[in-house]
């Protein structure tokens, strides 16, 4: 019996009955065995078929078989109810080999011409399976010439059988206090040949509780305990399971903070698996009772390990642990069922004793010594000589623990000295002057330091003077001996002040005229204001109206008198303001250089002379009465004049203070 072609020869060709296309003889038997390469199959079809027809093709036939399976037994020319002829059918081997057998019996009633067939090897598409048959691959099947291969979706790995996809389902660790885990693909069927390990690992002190939820379906066996697929639960104390079947296992209270769940599947079955919802519990901490005037947040039925609460105090109360203040308080429940810190108190805010007010006093309004939340105090300044600046002096103890004014200020009010008070109710280089009485010129300052000069007290720690009077001491402020509160130049009874810094106007040039002849001395301490020591006021914007030509100003000092000596007693002189053009003209003739009198100067004195300021009065104030406020203000600073004090046709020249208000204010606010 011819074998036919065998691989690796080319697998295609023609088969025909003996004698074809002539009639075939009786008692013939012919067998062909065709073999294709692995992964290929054989395709066969007939181009001519003419065999004797007999019941179930018992006489003459062509039989096609592949392995042990008969694919077809063929006879006749056309198919009948019980016999089959090939017609246009194509036949395929089941594997890579095909057997063809031709047989004729002992007789033919008439001549039959037999058959002609063609065959060829073709690739098998292993990925195509008949309905109802198991798929070739678990997930993805890839056909190629001569074979196929399988691959898996993400999260799976190809089993060593090269067809099954095993789940990559180990090493998952759950650390949250509750959660869910399930078999792979749940609720769809779980994968075959898989071994899954899940870990729940909570902090020490927690105990894991497992609840099986929704559905449970793991392949089982009626007699043997879970021989195929199973679920096991392991703790450090005990093992639960194995579990399989269709009944939801009961809740498992593991009494452990670590749990390992193992799920193993075999190669067969179609089951949906399982789902576990896990929670945890721990030893509860004592229920937190809020301190008086406080509340707990969040409010829970119970507090267990890692749970926390915070305490919030009502407005006007503050968190204190003993004497120590806290901005916030949070306690955490520990594994032994205790809180990690004790409960604080919500204590009423206490602003404490209010600070002393320099030159003022404080009065408790709410009650003697009451300094707690919403308590009220009243600051006031020492009458007559001080006035309160900015606010009304009423302060409330607020929730932040600070005494706060009605304007929201937390700083103390300021008792500012009242300026421009004088014992004189009306208005001499004091030359031709009169003796001053106590309280007449309480702003008068005596400056000693090389020469005798004067100044005027501003506020309670500044002295206004002439630049030329303190120029030599500008770098050695401490050399200035500053005295106030006395009438007698040589008296041992005076208030001593010392200079902290000297500020000379940047526009002043020493020994080159007297323009910008103005300076400020900052005292190193505030002086106490009284009837003998009171600051002079600075001019208001409207002050020019009290300093017109012929308006009377008063100059005071210990300068030279008519007798040619420094005055022992403070002297003063009332002198009128001189027209500026008239004064300029008076100083345009020699020996004075042109432009000696500038717009930053004002002149005062009598045309007839006799009343003037003189050497030793330099830096002192030329003051005017503001009739609206009834306060004295400084209009001029004794600066320069004729060599002969009180000379007719010559006038005393003063620095015009109103021109320097911004300069004065800037220096005082900056320093």
């Amino acid at each position: 019996t011819p074998l036919g072609p065998k691989w690796p020869e080319p697998v295609f060709g023609r088969l025909a009955s003996p004698g074809f296309p002539g009639e075939y003889a009786n008692d013939q038997e012919r067998r062909w065995t065709l073999t294709a390469p692995p992964g290929y199959r054989l395709r066969l079809y007939f181009t001519h078929f003419d065999l004797e027809l007999s019941h179930l093709c018992e006489y003459d036939f062509v039989k096609l078989s592949s392995g042990a399976k008969v694919l077809a037994t063929l006879c006749g020319q056309e198919s009948t109810d019980t016999e089959r002829a090939p017609g246009k059918d194509t036949f395929y081997s089941l594997g890579s080999s095909l057997d063809i057998t031709f047989r004729s019996d002992y007789s033919n009633e008439k001549p039959f011409t037999g058959f002609e067939a063609f065959y060829a090897a073709e690739d098998i598409d292993e990925c195509q399976v008949a309905p109802g048959e198991a798929p070739t691959c678990d997930h993805h099947c890839h056909n190629h010439l001569g074979g196929f291969y399988c691959s898996c979706r993400a999260g799976y790995v190809l089993h060593r059988n090269k067809r099954t996809c095993s789940a990559l389902c180990s090493g998952q660790v759950f650390t949250q206090r509750s959660g869910e885990l399930s078999s792979p693909e749940y609720p769809r069927p779980y994968p075959k040949l898989s071994s899954c390990t899940y870990s729940i690992s909570l902090e020490e002190g927690f105990s894991v509780i497992l609840d099986f939820v929704e559905s449970f379906d793991v392949e089982t066996h009626p007699e043997t305990l879970c021989p195929y697929d199973f679920l096991k639960i392991q703790t450090d104390r005990e093992e639960h399971g194995p579990f399989c079947g269709k009944t939801l296992p009961h809740r498992i209270e593991t009494k452990s903070n670590t749990v390992t769940i193992t799920f193993v599947t075999d190669e067969s079955g179609d089951h949906t698996g399982w789902k576990i919802h896990y929670t945890s519990t721990a030893q509860p901490c004592p229920y937190p009772m809020a301190p008086p005037n406080g509340h707990v947040s969040p409010v829970q039925a119970k507090y267990i390990l890692k749970d926390s609460f915070s305490i919030f105090c009502e407005t006007g109360y503050e968190l204190l642990q003993g004497h120590l203040p806290l901005k916030s308080f949070t306690a955490v429940c520990q594994k032994d069922g205790s809180w990690d810190r004790p409960m604080p108190a919500c204590s009423i805010v206490d602003c404490g004793p209010p600070d002393d007010l320099p030159s003022g006093r404080v009065e408790y309004i709410t009650g003697p010594g009451v300094t707690t939340y919403k308590a009220v105090i009243q600051y006031s300044c020492e009458e007559t000589f001080y006035t309160m600046k900015v606010n009304d002096g009423k302060y409330v103890c607020e929730a932040d623990g600070f005494w706060t004014s009605s304007k929201g200020e937390k700083s103390l009010p300021v008792c500012e000295p009242v300026c421009g008070l004088s014992a004189r109710t009306t208005g001499g280089r004091i030359y031709g002057g009169q003796k001053a009485k106590p309280g007449d010129f309480p702003w008068q300052v005596l400056i000693l330091g090389g020469t005798t000069a004067a100044g005027a007290l501003l506020y309670d720690n500044w002295v206004l003077t002439a630049a030329h009077a303190v120029y030599e001491q500008k770098h050695d402020a401490s050399a200035l001996d500053i005295r106030m509160g006395t009438l007698k130049r040589l008296s041992p009874h005076y208030t001593q002040a010392w200079s902290e810094a000297v500020f000379i106007h940047e526009g002043y040039t020493h020994d080159a005229g007297f323009d910008n002849d103005i300076a400020l001395i900052k005292l190193n301490n505030k002086v106490v204001i009284n009837s003998n020591i009171t600051p002079i006021c600075l001019p208001r914007k409207e002050a020019e109206s009290f300093m017109r030509t012929d308006d009377i100003g008063t100059a005071s000092g210990w300068g030279l008198t008519q007798r040619g000596f420094l005055a022992r007693n403070l002297m003063y002189v009332d002198i009128p303001i001189v027209d500026h053009q008239k004064c300029t003209a008076a100083y345009e003739k020699p020996p004075y250089p042109r432009g000696s009198v500038t717009a930053n100067m004002l002149c005062a004195g009598l045309e007839s002379g006799g009343k003037d300021s003189c050497r030793g009065d330099s830096g002192g104030a030329l003051v005017f009465l503001d009739s609206e406020t009834e306060r004295w203000f400084v209009g001029g600073i004794v600066s320069w004049g004729s060599m002969n004090c009180g000379e007719a046709g010559q006038y005393g020249v003063y620095t015009k203070v109103i021109n320097y208000i911004p300069w004065i204010e800037n220096i005082i606010s900056d320093f």
């Epitope: 642990q321 003993g322 203040p325 806290l326 901005k327 810190r341 004790p342 623990g401 600070f402």
Partner: antibody, heavy 118, light 106 residues
């Protein structure tokens, strides 16, 4: 980590003022807690001097009221001690410390030695 | 001011021993007491707060107890590194330290 560092002169003359600075790193002094000055005299006795709280409020040892002032500069995360009219009895090692009564760790500076002597 | 009295200035002990350092307040301070350990040349280190709460990182051989006026710091199984001076601090009303107890080897 919270760190505190004291700085200031090691020698002060009697009747003068003692001024020390505590520089805090790793935590804002306005966030919470009390920021204290504590001193340790020769012989190891510890004395709490006072604190400035996160809000800027101060509390002083009653025995030092009138001489002590604690202030702060929140922009530099520093707080300061000023002790006026010092005498030889104020010779000590001065520590700045964050004290919280258990609400967070206590942290101390390494201390700075101050001698009052003419 | 509340006075905190540590009656024993020195205490002798051996490695492995159990020792108790006591502190008495002149008036009720609730549980607002802390304990500190100080070694020569170092700043104090906090051990216990609120009378009985141990700071994290402090070995559990250190325990604190007491409330009101009487407080105790107990060191069980004394180690050589525990030889130091121990101070109590009350922070109930202002802050005051005890005078200190020095733990030394027998």
């Amino acid at each position: 980590d919270v760190q505190l560092q004291e700085s200031g002169p090691g020698l002060v003359k009697p009747s003068q003022s003692l001024s020390l600075t505590c520089t805090v790193t790793g935590y804002s002094i306005t966030s919470d807690y009390a920021w204290n000055w504590i001193r340790q005299f020769p012989g190891n006795t510890l004395e709490w001097m006072g604190y400035i709280s996160y809000s800027g409020r101060t509390s002083y040892n009653p025995s030092l009221i009138g001489r002590i002032s604690i202030t702060r500069d929140t922009t530099k995360n520093q707080f300061f001690l000023q002790l006026n009219s010092v005498s030889t009895e104020d010779t000590a090692t001065y520590y700045c410390a964050k004290l919280a009564g258990g609400h967070g760790m206590d942290y101390w500076g390494q201390g700075t030695s101050v001698t009052v002597s003419s | 001011n509340i006075v905190m009295t540590q009656s024993q200035q020195f205490m002798s002990t051996s490695v492995g021993d159990r020792v108790s350092v006591t502190c008495k307040a002149s008036q009720n301070v609730d549980t607002n007491v802390a304990w500190y350990q100080q070694k020569p040349g170092q700043s104090p280190k906090a051990l216990i707060y609120s009378a009985s709460y141990r700071y994290s990182g402090v070995p559990d051989r250190f325990t604190g107890s007491g409330s009101g006026t009487d407080f105790t710091l107990t060191i069980s199984n004394v180690q050589s590194e525990d030889l130091a001076e121990y101070f109590c601090l009350q922070y109930n009303s202002y802050l005051t330290f005890g005078s200190g107890t020095k733990l030394e080897l027998k």
